[in-house]
Interface confidence: low
């Protein structure tokens, strides 16, 4: 079937752009921050398979270390994450980008999406936590349309510096409780949820405490269902994965749609050495295709016993009568010994179309 020739625009999070090859960029992050390093292909051309290396050792992806072909994220950074990071071409080991990362105990500057300066401690010797921006905490009820990003903030201070934790409906709230994950920016006293869905409705409480006391604030989130709408997708984390030859990989994508969506897992492939058709549409092969039986589908693509040819970009695509939504996933496959081991991209077989 024809799904049109929709242009796919991949949104990018606020991140550090890569330096010119050969340059070393000096970066400082605060403890608890997310270190995000970006290494776009030189000259904007194709980059081929890459590997991220820290202090000479290939980085192993985990729930905290998210490795993609052009981007590296290290969540909840600590002092141990300081070091020399580089992005290299897997085949040639040529260094494409080089970063010197230092993680300090002090909060990082910037990365504050709404540009607010953080409140400074007023110099009180010791004391229980207190709100530094109470006027910014008036809005207790937040009603947002589905698919929007929500940010709750509880700017506070105290001595010693208090800790902040979050509850949803009175229970501990962690990233794994939500398919799209959450961003906890401790230095900004904030909780961020991207692409909210109806199941995110509820009461969110920040708990700020130190040894002298505890304060809390509760916000109520209402997610407005826009009907009808094109499917809403959330990518399960990590969206980009590196796997060892012969292992199993699972990509996870959540689809919300009022109307029964047609869901597909696709893989980008090359045809006669080209990744795009004559009209500029990428070539993809259909791996799985079905009509969802529910309005909230938890969809998975499982790849068993992966080989080099399984590496590349995968798409979770959902289509209903309103429109199309898709999420991209990257898989990098390497040999059993070292993450930097040379990989040769193999041509794909199977039914291919430009989609």
């Amino acid at each position: 079937e024809s799904l049109g020739t929709e242009q796919r625009v991949v949104g990018r999070a606020a991140e550090v752009p890569g330096p010119e090859p050969g340059q070393q960029e000096q970066l400082v992050f605060g403890s608890g921050d997310a270190v995000e390093l970006s290494c776009p292909p030189p000259g904007g051309g194709p980059m081929g398979p890459t590997v991220w290396v820290k202090d000479g050792t290939g980085l192993v992806p985990s729930e905290r270390v998210l490795v993609g072909p052009q981007r590296l994220q290290v969540l909840n950074a600590s002092h141990e994450d300081s070091g020399a990071y580089s992005c290299r071409q897997r085949l040639t080991q040529r260094v494409l980008c080089h970063f010197s990362v230092r993680v300090t105990d002090a909060p990082s500057s910037g990365d504050d999406e709404d540009g607010e300066d953080e409140a400074e401690d007023t110099g009180v010797d010791t004391g229980a936590p207190y709100w530094t921006r109470p006027e910014r905490m008036d809005k207790k009820l937040l009603a947002v349309p589905a698919a929007n990003t929500v940010r709750f903030r509880c700017p506070a201070a105290g001595n010693p510096t208090p800790s902040i934790s979050w509850l949803k409906n009175g229970r501990e709230f962690r990233g794994e409780h939500r398919i799209g994950g959450i961003k906890l920016r401790h230095q900004q006293w904030s909780l961020v949820m991207e692409s909210v869905v109806p199941s995110d409705r509820g009461n969110y409480t920040c708990v700020v405490e130190n040894k002298f006391g505890s304060i809390r604030q509760t916000y109520t989130l209402d997610v407005l269902e826009r009907s009808p709408h094109r499917p809403i997708l959330q990518a399960g984390l990590p969206a980009n994965q590196t796997a060892v030859l012969g292992s199993d990989v699972e990509f996870h994508c959540k689809v919300y749609s009022d109307a029964q969506p047609h869901i597909q897992w696709l893989k980008h492939v090359e045809v006669n050495g080209s990744k795009v058709g004559p009209d500029g549409t990428p070539y993809v092969t259909v791996l799985k295709s079905w009509i969802s039986e529910s309005v909230e589908a938890d969809v998975r693509l499982r790849l068993a016993n992966v080989s080099e040819r399984d590496g590349g970009e995968y798409l979770c695509r959902a289509t209903n009568f309103i429109g199309v939504a898709e999420k991209a996933f990257w898989l990098s496959v390497h040999g059993p010994r070292a993450a930097e081991e040379e990989l040769v991209e193999a041509d794909e077989a199977g039914s291919v179309y430009a989609g």
Partner: antibody, heavy 120, light 106 residues
Framework: EIQLQQSGPELVKPGASVKVSCKAS????????MYWVKQSHGKSLEWIGY????????RYNQKFKGKATLTVDKSSSTAYMHLNSLTSEDSAVYYC?????????????WGQGTLVTVSA | QIVLTQSPALMSASPGEKVTMTCSAS?????MYWYQQKPRSSPKPWIY???NLASGVPARFSGSGSGTSYSLTISSMEAEDAATYYC?????????FGAGTKLELK
């Protein structure tokens, strides 16, 4: 109508092997993973593993690695489970089950079960 | 592996009575799934993604929970609800089931 039709009961001797079949109908066989589940008499359910009929890829519960082998015949839309070196511990009802229509991690359709009895 | 502990193992309820059974996970899970099984029958899908009723399941059933604590509730017990109910997770390998809660009619 989606149906999973399993083969009949088996009485086998210790040390022997058995092959249980599960014929699928009413849906695109290669579009959904097929799972196998063991239920010992009066006991709970245990996941054995699954096979993706699309590419033959398998994943096993570590406990059943070496005990069970999963295969498919795409031409007949049939999934098979081969159990080897049988002991009395393997006496159970074995179910094939298909995952939910949207790849949820659950079993939306079940076969009627195949009773395997291991006895000398 | 994640162990799912169902309680009570055995319970009985009179028609019209509210019934709640629980499933406790040894580690946090994203979703819980529930199945109903009657003697000499295959399990039937009952509740998926914690709170969604499978096709044909009466509205008197509901599911809830998060993290390590989940429950299945029947608002008003009926004779046909007598069965064994199993919970299941696949947030972590291997996929595991609970030992079951057998619900009898009083």
């Amino acid at each position: 109508e989606i149906q999973l039709q399993q083969s009949g009961p088996e009485l086998v001797k210790p040390g022997a092997s058995v092959k249980v079949s599960c014929k699928a109908s009413g849906y695109a066989f290669t579009s959904y993973n097929m799972y196998w589940v063991k239920q010992s008499h009066g006991k709970s359910l245990e996941w054995i593993g699954y096979i993706d009929p699309y590419n033959g890829g398998t994943r096993y519960n570590q406990k059943f690695k070496g005990k069970a082998t999963l295969t498919v015949d795409k031409s007949s839309s049939t999934a098979y489970m081969h159990l080897n070196s049988l002991t009395s511990e393997d006496s159970a009802v074995y179910y094939c089950a298909r995952e939910g229509g949207n790849y949820e991690a659950w079993f939306a359709y079940w076969g009627q079960g195949t009773l395997v009895t291991v006895s000398a | 592996q994640i162990v799912l502990t169902q309680s009570p193992a055995l319970m009985s309820a009179s028609p019209g009575e509210k019934v709640t059974m629980t499933c406790s996970a040894s580690s946090s899970v994203s979703y819980m799934y529930w199945y109903q099984q009657k003697p000499r029958s295959s399990p039937k899908p009952w509740i998926y993604l914690t709170s969604n009723l499978a096709s044909g399941v009466p509205a008197r059933f509901s599911g809830s929970g998060s993290g390590t604590s989940y429950s299945l509730t029947i608002s008003s017990m009926e004779a046909e609800d007598a069965a064994t109910y199993y919970c299941q997770q696949w947030s972590s390998n291997p996929l595991t089931f609970g030992a079951g809660t057998k619900l009898e009619l009083k």
